[in-house]
């Protein structure tokens, strides 16, 4: 599920339905944000590289009682091959940097958009 693939081909390859739905959920969160997301909760920043889905989940799973990101948490678990629980950290976390959930979601969305544009925009 985490393989984006296809970027060497002549045309772009659209995402799987699951990844498309994740992107759409991130868009919904960023566009419909009125009050501070998750009451301004802070999460560990991550390196947006290979394994980023698990790293993102490991970071976001530490936010509890925030219905706005529950769907995103569920979706990310579908992209992560191992079970993730609160307090778990991988080497992909930038452990000295915490950012607001809203910024984390925005960064993740921007990165996914960049990945899909890489194969088509010169």
């Amino acid at each position: 599920l985490t393989c984006l693939g296809g970027f060497a081909s002549p045309g772009p390859v659209p995402p799987s339905t699951a990844l498309r739905e994740l992107i759409e959920e991130l868009v919904n969160i960023t566009q419909n944000q009125k009050a501070p997301l998750c009451n301004g909760s802070m999460v560990w920043s991550i390196n947006l590289t290979a394994g980023m889905y698990c790293a993102a989940l490991e970071s976001l799973i530490n936010v509890s009682g925030c219905s706005a990101i529950e769907k995103t948490q569920r979706m990310l678990s579908g992209f992560c091959p191992h079970k993730v629980s609160a307090g778990q950290f991988s080497s992909l976390h930038v452990r000295d940097t915490k950012i607001e959930v809203a910024q984390f979601v925005k960064d993740l969305l921007l990165h996914l958009k960049k990945l899909f544009r890489e194969g088509q925009f010169n």
């Epitope: 002549p10 390859v13 659209p14 995402p15 992107i23 544009r117």
Partner: antibody
Framework: QVQLVQSGADVKKPGASVKVSCKAS????????IHWVRQAPGQGLEWMGA????????AYNQKFKGRATLTADKSTSTAYMELRSLRSDDTAVYYC????????????WGQGTLVTVSS | EIVLTQSPATLSLSPGERATLSCRAS??????LHWYQQKPGQAPRLLIY???QSISGIPARFSGSGSGTDFTLTISSLEPEDFAVYYC?????????FGGGTKVEIK
């Protein structure tokens, strides 16, 4: 509300160039790609190309590669489409439209700019 | 390049009748197919995205179906304002392409 406002109609001579502008408002300009579509009189829709305003990266329909140039100015939230070496069959209405990512639909369109190429 | 073939080119119907428009892709495009309506002198307007997803503000009489290579736009009961040209669009791969259009005219 989201709006894409294009420059006015233009008349050009064969061999000349035209530059059409598309000013976006009501949303964050760099969050969406801007695509350009044209429609010759009485004909269907033809995709010309797209630009990612955030990076300036472009993608072109092979038919227009080398003759069309797409640019975007983040400071004014304006996209531009320049078409060079105009021919009579370039007479068309040119539309700008926004797309979140290329596989998304074109949810908002400019009003269109009629470019007439005539000697 | 993905070629989209729309049929029929023209559909002559009366208000209240059901309209069924077809769009066939030259290769599998999953559900990456969008439908637009265009009236004379106006820009196209998005009706349906991802083959069957409805747009807020678009009347419920418009519906889409299909996946892979065969797609259908259905207008359950034509209203006077529905007489227009309808285009399907490939969102699967570059170059983005449109069908030739189906004109729905008053019989």
């Amino acid at each position: 509300q989201v709006q894409l406002v294009q420059s006015g109609a233009d008349v050009k001579k064969p061999g000349a160039s035209v530059k059409v502008s598309c000013k976006a408002s009501g949303y964050t300009f760099i969050d969406y790609e801007i695509h350009w579509v044209r429609q010759a009189p009485g004909q269907g829709l033809e995709w010309m190309g797209a630009i990612d305003p955030e990076t300036g990266g472009t993608a072109y329909n092979q038919k227009f590669k080398g003759r069309a140039t797409l640019t975007a100015d983040k400071s004014t939230s304006t996209a531009y489409m320049e078409l060079r070496s105009l021919r009579s069959d370039d007479t068309a209405v040119y539309y700008c439209t926004r797309i979140l990512l290329y596989y998304y639909p074109m949810d908002y369109w400019g009003q269109g700019t009629l470019v007439t190429v005539s000697s | 390049e993905i070629v989209l073939t729309q049929s029929p080119a023209t559909l002559s119907l009366s208000p209240g009748e059901r309209a069924t428009l077809s769009c066939r892709a030259s290769q599998n495009i999953s559900d990456y197919l969008h439908w637009y309506q265009q009236k004379p002198g106006q820009a196209p307007r998005l009706l349906i995205y991802y083959a069957s997803q409805s747009i807020s503000g678009i009347p419920a009489r418009f519906s889409g179906s299909g996946s892979g290579t065969d797609f259908t736009l259905t207008i359950s009961s034509l209203e006077p304002e529905d007489f227009a040209v309808y285009y399907c669009q490939n969102g699967h791969s570059f170059p983005l392409t449109f069908g030739g259009g189906t004109k729905v005219e008053i019989k």
